[in-house]
């Protein structure tokens, strides 16, 4: 089935090369050999901030291939994975593992997707099947969301799902993911 073996239930994540060739040794693994940035929102009062807008979180850059059945994108797409705890922007490190990690003693802040973008992708298929054009939804930026004690466990679980790569079989969110084709693609199919 062509690329079927390449694709499993979790989308394969390929570290982006050339960003941080020597990541901090304590975090050297497949999921963290990526560029990390803070959200860049400067705090007014970095040590006693109450405003979510004054918090920032890590935006990890990942590249992955888009698949549709046995077909795979000709090129990988790059998107963000929102990761980790949120803290005052000024205290967050610019790269993973640099500096101390700040943990709030009060409300919990989670790093979740903020904005999304749609991208057209051309997929190549094995066995002479016509190429497929699809659209995918990619995370474009992350934000900190304040969780109070009133948030129940299911909502916490939800944040965990959003913070990770979309997995196969997860429940669809209100936002959606799409596909596209050109006329040549259809004509080739007939």
């Amino acid at each position: 089935q062509g690329w079927q073996a390449f694709k499993n239930d979790a989308t394969e994540i390929i570290p982006e090369l050339g960003e941080y060739p020597e990541p901090p040794p304590e975090l050297e693994n497949n999921k963290t050999m990526n560029r990390a940035e803070n959200g860049g929102r400067p705090p007014h009062h970095p040590f006693e901030t109450k405003d979510v807008s004054e918090y920032s979180c890590r935006e990890l850059h990942f590249t992955r291939y888009v698949t549709d059945g046995p077909c795979r994108s000709a090129k990988p797409v790059t998107e963000l994975v929102c990761s980790g705890q949120c803290g005052p922007a000024r205290l967050l490190p610019n790269a993973i593992g640099r500096g101390k990690w700040w943990r709030p003693s009060g409300p919990d802040f989670r790093c979740i997707p903020d904005r999304y973008r749609a991208q057209r992708v051309q997929l190549l298929c094995p066995g002479g099947e016509a190429p497929r054009a699809r659209k995918v939804r990619l995370v474009a930026s992350c934000k900190c969301k304040r969780l109070t004690r009133f948030h129940n466990q299911s909502e916490l679980k939800d944040f965990g799902t959003e913070a990770a790569r979309p997995q196969k079989g997860r429940k669809p969110r209100p936002r959606a993911r799409s596909a596209k084709a050109n006329q040549a693609e259809l004509e080739n199919a007939y």
Partner: antibody
Framework: EVQLVQSGAEVKKPGASVKVSCKAS????????IHWVRQAPGQGLEWMGR????????TYVPKFQGRVTMTTDTSTSTAYMELRSLRSDDTAVYYC???????????????WGQGTLVTVSS | DIQLTQSPSFLSASVGDRVTITCSVS???????LHWYQQKPGKAPKLLIY???NLASGVPSRFSGSGSGTEFTLTISSLQPEDFATYYC????????FGQGTKLEIK
């Protein structure tokens, strides 16, 4: 809330044309493919094609090639399907639908318009 | 062109019954490309299951899907009054194709 609202029922004579509209709200139409599917009375669903509102690129089933034109007006978030040289067997409910983006590596139509009945009769 | 054939075309059942609808595909497709829709009279179709076995948002857990290659099934574990409708399988590779539909009626 995601919605696709279609224009009202039409009665046309054979040989005429019909243009059905589909107004999208609750999402950015440019991010999604819009599909058109029709259903003749008492029959099953028949895919006609789809359009990318972002660039106007469309895909038509060969059966409708030359008779159908799909367009969009992104300023009003509206998709259109025009079918020309109507015949009595074009009498059907015409649906617009959105292809969802949020299902991992799955591609399914997740929201549909309410349908527009087009009756072709002399 | 990939053809989808549903069986049975008509199905009579009672509330509480377990029912299974089969969708046969003319050539093997990936399970990620097979979806199921429910349609009630005078209404637009509604996405029920995507990618063979994944429930769409708001769909009750009594619905389930399975299969691979050329044989796929939709199962309703315990029929409820609101489940009487027409069900369509659909594949999306380079073209969209629907099965002819299975009308589920009250016995």
């Amino acid at each position: 809330e995601v919605q696709l609202v279609q224009s009202g029922a039409e009665v046309k004579k054979p040989g005429a044309s019909v243009k059905v509209s589909c107004k999208a709200s609750g999402f950015n139409i440019k991010d999604y493919y819009i599909h058109w599917v029709r259903q003749a009375p008492g029959q099953g669903l028949e895919w006609m094609g789809r359009i990318d509102p972002d660039n106007g690129e469309s895909t038509y089933v060969p059966k409708f090639q030359g008779r159908v034109t799909m367009t969009t007006d992104t300023s009003t978030s509206t998709a259109y399907m025009e079918l020309r040289s109507l015949r009595s067997d074009d009498t059907a409910v015409y649906y617009c639908a959105r292809e969802g983006l949020d299902y991992g590596d799955y591609y399914a139509v997740d929201y549909w318009g309410q349908g527009t009945l087009v009756t072709v009769s002399s | 062109d990939i053809q989808l054939t549903q069986s049975p075309s008509f199905l009579s059942a009672s509330v509480g019954d377990r029912v299974t609808i089969t969708c046969s595909v003319s050539s093997s497709i990936s399970s990620s490309n097979l979806h199921w829709y429910q349609q009630k009279p005078g209404k637009a179709p509604k996405l029920l299951i995507y990618g063979t076995s994944n429930l769409a948002s708001g769909v009750p857990s009594r619905f389930s899907g399975s299969g691979s290659g050329t044989e796929f099934t939709l199962t309703i574990s315990s029929l409820q009054p609101e489940d009487f409708a027409t069900y369509y399988c659909q594949q999306w590779t380079t073209t969209y194709t629907f099965g002819q539909g299975t009308k589920l009626e009250i016995k």
